[in-house]
Each structure stands twice: as structure tokens, then as C-alpha cells.
């Protein structure tokens, strides 16, 4: 059950976990006020080295920036700290507090806001765009496999309630650049495409403005194009056994592949005593292939049941599709059972069934 | 044009097994996936689980695990709907889906959409 | 599971009307919802994703709205083409899952 995992880490550029959407706090600050924010220790234990950073970017200390492990002081704030801070754990990037900060001409009321994605008209300040969950915004990178859909968000507030647009490679984008258009929902702060193709990619910026002041964020799209390719056999699969004569060995190949694959297990056999026939072809015989309710799951694993001497010797894994074929092989060796305990001593590695 | 036909229906036995192909055509087969969602007479849609060809990975419905399985040979643009251990109440037309993601760096989650259905074809469990 | 209740399960309505489905999901699934039309006979057609984006193709009287628990399908001038059962179905998590259906009938 591992599609929507597996699409996701494929997808998405990996990035340092955040905390929960309600740890996220929204305040406002008027301009001129000091803006004090403050981090205590997660369950009140230690704290290790944390940095301060806002919009991404670690905050230096100076007269008018105060850096503490566990508070930040910015004094006589003006509409340029406005932004989003957060105090993370230095050697981890871990993020442990989250803050949404906007500072306006009006004094602070002292009322923090929801962090909708909507857009909302407070009627009570004014101030500059900010993001409404800033700790959403921390990937940058989407790759995706082309033929999918793209959405790019951006939600902010502001009072008035700021406008959107987007830029690509730093060029104004609508819809009629690419084939198949483009989805705006200014209400919902996106920008959808679909069906995504090689030349979707590129930078995509929005732009959040409204008269007292813009933010942007800047997305990278990557488009992947699949080329087709044999199959690619897990390395160290199958793996050399140890068995004493009578157990049961397994022996495991793990098969990725685009196109659907045809995996056979095969024993490697002498023939008047050579191994390999005139042309250099090794000599074998087939112990397992497809049938008609064999599953790929099935094929991966070959079952050896109380084993014999005649058991022992090389088998490969051997995985084909419309491309080409691929193989890994492994060696089993049968001990005579009285000879366990000794071995055992020795190597570590006898199994006995 | 994009198109998906849907093949190997038919009556089985209960304990039986059958195999359903849907091929399809024009399309990128590789990056996109194949879902399989069946309806049982009279009733409503029902979703029996998906195939991403790209890397092969599969997910499946709990009433169905370990019966049914979903396979896809790219060269051929064709999925595949191996089922097993067939009762009666898997009586149903089963559709093939075109299945695409909604790639979204702000949610947590990738949302995928079924926009391409074949015809149908229907499956009978019967003795 | 995630359950979708779609309500109501059958209506009547006339040339013209304003036509309104709501479905409603047992737990939050973000704005992860689409909805499908299907005729007699025939495979659902995708109308609507991302609950109110509108799938390319399909008429602008169709729109959707909603996120969290509740979703709504509107069709704002029903047309003759239009009598047909109607799905929402998540894809918040795996597995997906359908609404019971709401079947449109001419009055």
C-alpha cells in the first residue's frame, strides 16, 4: 500500500518537518512597537542551539535585533519586519515555533487572526501582505511526471486584501503561453495546470501586492520524462546461502521495471561435464517461470525444500521485458548436517531450514 | 484521443479466476496511472484499487487484497486486473480509469483524479 | 474509510431548474473531491476536481464548491442531457471513496 508515498517522495523536494498548523501564531505589531517573540523548549526540556530566522533567512543580531535561544526582540519595528520567523534547533533545522508577523501603521490591537486561506477584510487594520501559513511555503521543488497536474498556492491576507499574479522565469504568465491554458483562482490564491509537459518548466513567482507592500515566493517545476529501460534487479539479490543438507532455502529477486516483466529462475548445469555450450551460453534448466495464476510476487521468491547436494551450485534470477533482459546470480552451498555445529562456530552463517 | 477498451469479462465459478486487459491509446501510458473501479448491478462505483506503471506500485481495496492483482506492460499500453478466489459478490462491470495526481507543494497529500473511463465490462460470478 | 453521504439520494427537477447536490464527508479531506456523471449503461464521466475546479470540456453550468466535510455540485440550468446519476468521491486518502449517488429525474 505505498502509491501515495511513493508518488509524494518522488514528487516533492524533502524538507525539515515542521510543527502543527496550530502551533503557527499570527500577531500584529504596530509600527514602532517592539515585536518580542518568544520560543520556550518543547515539554519544558532542554533546548540545544536554535537560530532565528525570517522569510528564510537567518536573522543577525544587532542593536535593533536581539537574539536570544529562546526570545527575539526586534525594536521599533517598521513594515519591512514583517514576514514570517521561526526558531529552529541549529544542528537539526527543526522547526520548534512558528510566527506570522505583520507590522502596521495603525497601534497594535493586540488580536491575533485565524490562518485562513481565504482572504479576509479585518476592517480594523492595514498592512501589508503577509502568508497565511508560511510554514506550508518552505518547499520549493516540485518534480513531476509529465502528463499530471500542477497546483502552485500562495494564500495571503492584508488589509486591503491583496491582489495575485504570476510571473514565469520572471516574466508575466497567462494563459494563452501554454497549451491547455492555465487555472487561476485568485479566491483561492492558485495557479493549476494540467497535463504538465517538459516545457512547463521553469521558475513560477507569485506576486502579492497590495499599496502597502508586496511579498513573492518563487516555485521550481521539474517535468520528468520516463525513457524506457530493461529491468533493474535489486543489488545483492539473490543473495549466496549456507544450508544443511535437508532445510529449505529461499532465494529473493527483487524486479523494477517500466514495462511489464517475464522472471524466471534458473539452475546453472553441466553438460558432459562443461558448463557452457560452444558459443560461451551457459547451460541451464528453468526451476520456475510464469504460469497462468503466478503473480510477480511469487516469481520473485525460489522455494527450495529439503535440500540435497544436488541442490548446491549456481542460480540465477533472470528478468526480461520488451527492452532487454536483466540478471543477478547466487551461489548455494550444502553441508552435511554433522558438520552444523562446527560451521556454525566458524562462519555464523548456517541456517538449518 | 485518449480511449480505454476493457477486455475478459465473462461467467466464472465461484473459487475460479479471470483476467481483464484495458488498453489504452493516446496517451502517455508511463506517467500516468490506471485505476480499476467496478459497479455491481444497480448499485453505485466502487473503487478495487490502481496501478502507477512508472514504478509499478500498487494499492487495492481491503475487499479485494490478496485476490486481486494489477499489473501494466508498457510496451503494449495495456493494464492488467488479475482476479482470483472469485465469490459473488464480485459480480460487476469493472471500468478501467485513466488516473493522474494533483502534484500540490502546500497540501500533504497528492489527490488523484480519474478522468478517462473505458466502457465496462462485466464480470459474473456465478455456479 | 473515509464515508461520503451525498443527499439527496433522488430528485425531480424541470428543464431549467437550479439543481443543488451536497455530499458530505465523515472526516476532512482538504478540497480533495471530484465529482462524476453517469448515464444508463455507460462509464462516469469526470466533471469536477479539486472540488470546484472544472474538468476541461464540461459545460460552465455545471460548479462546485466546498472543502473540509461539506461539498455541493451545482448545475445552474438543468438541460435535457443532464438526467443522470451523479457520484462525489474523495481522494484525500487511499481508498478512495464514493458517494451512494444522487440520481437527477425529469419531473
Known amino acids: 500500500e505505498s502509491l501515495g508515498t511513493e508518488q509524494r517522495v518522488v514528487g516533492r523536494a524533502a524538507e525539515v518537518p515542521g510543527p502543527e498548523p496550530g502551533q503557527q501564531e499570527q500577531l500584529v505589531f504596530g509600527s514602532g512597537d517592539a515585536v518580542e517573540l518568544s520560543c520556550p523548549p518543547p515539554g519544558g526540556g532542554p533546548m540545544g542551539p536554535t537560530v532565528w530566522v525570517k522569510d528564510g533567512t537567518g536573522l543577525v543580531p544587532s542593536e535593533r535585533v536581539l537574539v536570544g535561544p529562546q526570545r527575539l526582540q526586534v525594536l521599533n519595528a517598521s513594515h519591512e519586519d514583517s514576514g514570517a520567523y521561526s526558531c529552529r534547533q541549529r544542528l537539526t533545522q527543526r522547526v520548534l515555533c512558528h510566527f506570522s508577523v505583520r507590522v502596521t501603521d495603525a497601534p497594535s490591537s493586540g488580536d491575533d487572526e485565524d490562518g485562513e486561506d481565504e482572504a479576509e477584510d479585518t476592517g480594523v487594520d492595514t498592512g501589508a501582505p503577509y502568508w497565511t501559513r508560511p510554514e506550508r511555503m518552505d518547499k520549493k521543488l516540485l518534480a513531476v511526471p509529465a502528463a499530471n497536474t500542477v497546483r502552485f498556492r500562495c494564500p495571503a491576507a492584508g488589509n486591503p486584501t491583496p491582489s495575485i499574479s504570476w510571473l514565469k522565469n520572471g516574466r508575466e504568465f497567462r494563459g494563452e503561453h501554454r497549451i491547455g491554458g492555465i487555472k487561476l483562482r485568485h479566491q483561492q490564491w492558485s495557479l493549476v495546470m494540467e497535463s504538465v509537459v517538459p516545457s512547463d518548466r521553469g521558475n513560477y513567482t507569485c506576486v502579492v501586492e497590495n499599496k502597502f507592500g508586496s511579498i513573492r515566493q518563487t516555485y521550481t517545476l521539474d517535468v520528468l520524462e520516463r525513457s524506457p529501460h530493461r529491468p533493474i534487479l535489486q543489488a545483492g539479490l539473490p543473495a549466496n546461502q549456507t544450508a544443511v543438507l535437508g532445510s529449505d532455502v529461499e532465494f529473493h529477486c527483487k524486479v523494477y521495471s517500466d514495462a511489464q516483466p517475464h522472471i524466471q529462475w534458473l539452475k546453472h548445469v553441466e553438460v558432459n561435464g562443461s558448463k557452457v555450450g560452444p558459443d560461451g551460453t551457459p547451460y541451464v534448466t528453468v526451476l520456475k517461470t510464469a504460469g497462468a495464476n503466478t503473480t510477480d510476487k511469487e516469481l520473485e521468491v525460489l522455494s527450495l525444500h529439503n535440500v540435497t547436494f544436488e541442490d548446491a551450485g549456481e542460480y540465477t534470477c533472470l528478468a526480461g521485458n520488451s527492452i532487454g533482459f536483466s540478471h543477478h546470480s547466487a551461489w548455494l552451498v550444502v553441508l552435511p548436517a554433522e558438520e552444523e555445529l562446527v560451521e556454525a562456530d566458524e562462519a555464523g552463517s548456517v541456517y538449518a531450514g | 484521443e485518449v480511449q480505454l477498451v476493457e477486455s475478459g469479462g465473462g461467467l466464472v465459478q465461484p473459487g475460479g479466476s479471470l483476467r481483464l486487459s484495458c488498453a489504452a491509446s493516446?496517451?502517455?501510458?508511463?506517467?500516468?496511472?490506471i485505476s480499476w473501479v467496478r459497479q455491481a448491478p444497480g448499485k453505485g462505483l466502487e473503487w478495487v484499487g490502481r496501478i502507477y506503471p512508472t514504478n509499478g506500485s500498487t494499492n487495492y481495496a481491503d475487499s479485494v487484497k490478496g485476490r486481486f492483482t494489477i499489473s501494466a506492460d508498457t510496451s503494449k499500453n495495456t493494464a492488467y486486473l488479475q482476479m482470483n478466489s472469485l465469490r459473488a459478490e464480485d459480480t460487476a462491470v469493472y471500468y478501467c480509469?485513466?488516473?493522474?495526481?494533483?502534484?500540490?507543494?502546500?497540501?500533504?497529500?497528492?489527490?488523484?483524479?480519474?478522468?478517462?473511463w473505458g466502457q465496462g465490462t462485466l464480470v459474473t460470478v456465478s455456479s | 474509510d473515509i464515508q461520503m453521504t451525498q443527499s439527496p439520494s433522488s430528485l425531480s427537477a424541470s428543464v431549467g431548474d437550479r439543481v443543488t447536490i451536497t455530499c458530505r464527508a465523515s472526516q476532512d479531506v482538504s478540497t480533495a473531491v471530484a465529482w462524476y456523471q453517469q448515464k444508463p449503461g455507460k462509464a462516469p464521466k469526470l466533471l469536477i476536481y479539486?472540488?470546484?475546479f472544472l474538468y476541461s470540456g464540461v459545460p460552465s453550468r455545471f460548479s462546485g464548491s466546498g472543502s473540509g466535510t461539506d461539498f455541493t455540485l451545482t448545475i445552474s440550468s438543468l438541460q435535457p442531457e443532464d438526467f443522470a446519476t451523479y457520484y462525489c468521491?474523495?481522494?484525500?486518502?487511499?481508498?478512495?471513496?464514493f458517494g451512494q449517488g444522487t440520481k437527477v429525474e425529469i419531473k
Open positions: 493516446g496517451f502517455t501510458f508511463t506517467s500516468t496511472g
Open positions: 480509469a485513466r488516473t493522474y495526481g494533483i502534484y500540490d507543494l502546500y497540501v500533504d497529500y497528492t489527490e488523484y483524479v480519474m478522468d478517462y
Open positions: 468521491q474523495q481522494s484525500y486518502t487511499t481508498p478512495p471513496t
Open positions: 479539486s472540488a470546484s
